[in-house]
């Protein structure tokens, strides 16, 4: 039994890191393998992650971690019974994929303005709380070409757009994702989408 693709890990910079790897053949990850991990820290202890299958030869492990700080470094040991298959390390702050924003809501009762709000996925004491920026994707269910992205580069988790920038009388969906420039993160997954019917009063045209 050998590792074909070494484990690669990403952290949510909060409490979970996800490691994926591939074996050289079909493997029952949960019965044959164990991933041991330990924070390099005087008061830490070793933990064991039981991997799950991720395709025939693929394995994935969800590591429960202490609240992350930038200096953290974890040792990783992949075992098959008594055989050490791979040894490595992982710095969560160097491989961050933020959590997805939640609670996306479209407020349509603000005088021909659409107000989209969502929740920051981190608690205020987390470093990423004040460093997230967002991308909001709005698209029409009727017209695949009517697809737009709004970049929200300020900290407030909200976006205002004029209802008239979208077509009236049809349904739209929106979703939002996050990233943090400070740690050069990847984008988060998209939030669940939310749907609304766009309608607004056409301005009265005088002739």
């Amino acid at each position: 039994m050998k590792v074909l693709q070494e484990p690669t890990c990403v952290s949510d910079y909060m409490s979970i890191s996800t490691c994926e790897w591939k074996m050289n053949g079909p493997t029952n990850c949960s019965t044959e393998l164990r991933l041991l991990y330990q924070l390099v820290f005087l008061l830490s202890e070793a933990h064991t992650c039981i991997p799950e299958n991720n395709g025939g030869a693929g394995c994935v492990c969800h590591l429960l971690m202490d609240d992350v700080v930038s200096a953290d470094n974890y040792t990783l040991d992949l075992w098959a019974g008594q055989q050490l298959l791979w040894k490595g390390s992982f710095k969560p702050s160097e491989h961050v994929k933020p959590r997805a924003p939640g609670n996306l809501t479209v407020h349509t009762n603000v005088s021909d303005t659409l107000l989209l709000t969502w929740s920051n996925p981190y608690p205020p004491d987390n470093y990423l709380y004040n460093h997230l920026t967002y991308a909001v994707n709005i698209w029409s269910e009727n017209d695949p070409a009517d697809f737009r992205i709004y970049n929200v580069t300020y900290l407030e988790p909200s976006l205002r757009i004029a209802a008239s920038t979208l077509k009236s009388g049809i349904s739209y969906r929106a979703r939002v994702r996050a990233w943090a420039q400070c740690y050069n993160t990847t984008w988060s997954e998209w939030s669940p989408s939310t749907k609304w019917h766009n309608s607004y009063r056409e301005p009265f045209e005088q002739h």
């Epitope: 390099v40 202490d66 200096a71």
Partner: antibody, heavy 115, light 109 residues
Framework: EVQLVESGGGLVQPGGSLRLSCAAS????????MFWVRQAPGKGLEWVSG???????SYADSVKGRFTISRDNAKNSLYLQMNSLRAEDMAVYYC?????????WGQGTLVTVSS | EIVLTQSPGTLSLSPGERATLSCRAS???????LAWYQQKPGQAPRLLIF???SRAPGIPDRFSGSGSGTDFTLTISRLEPEDFAVYYC??????????FGQGTKVEIK
Amino acid sequence: EVQLVESGGGLVQPGGSLRLSCAASGFTFSRNAMFWVRQAPGKGLEWVSGIGTGGATSYADSVKGRFTISRDNAKNSLYLQMNSLRAEDMAVYYCARGRYYFPWWGQGTLVTVSS
Amino acid sequence: EIVLTQSPGTLSLSPGERATLSCRASQSVSSSYLAWYQQKPGQAPRLLIFGASSRAPGIPDRFSGSGSGTDFTLTISRLEPEDFAVYYCQQYDHSAGWTFGQGTKVEIK
């Protein structure tokens, strides 16, 4: 908002015992290492003890064998049992949250050791 | 045990001046584990700098940290009235644990 509130300080005679408590709120207590740091009157800061998320502990040489740190994750509480107290243990005792350094501190509780 | 020695013991300066505080370690310290704190009378310490040079959230940019190995510096570019306080450096070591310097008092001249 992160809050750490110490209690249990007071006047104790040399050789006596005291138990300090720290009530934590505003964060996931179980995922954080916790510490006690003290400051004698007019002196500098001294790290006393720390406890990891899994219960691993460490102590300054000056308190080893006399002090015991513990935590109750269900109650979001940190404790310091201090036995065989000496005059040099008189200090403000701070509860702190952190790891390699301490971003969050309580306001401290004063322990006076005097006969 | 790693010993941190801060100098000077007291720094007498006027508002608007630049303050340079030194922290010297008895053996090499990882920059990732070097921090600076500010403490005012009757208050708990406040983290200013971590990782030798990263400002903690909410700390004004007049505070900066630098250094590596055994020599570290905290600089306050222009002293404000609220900056007069005692400053401590602190290090963490995987075997020796946590130690603080003895402090530098920045007082009004």
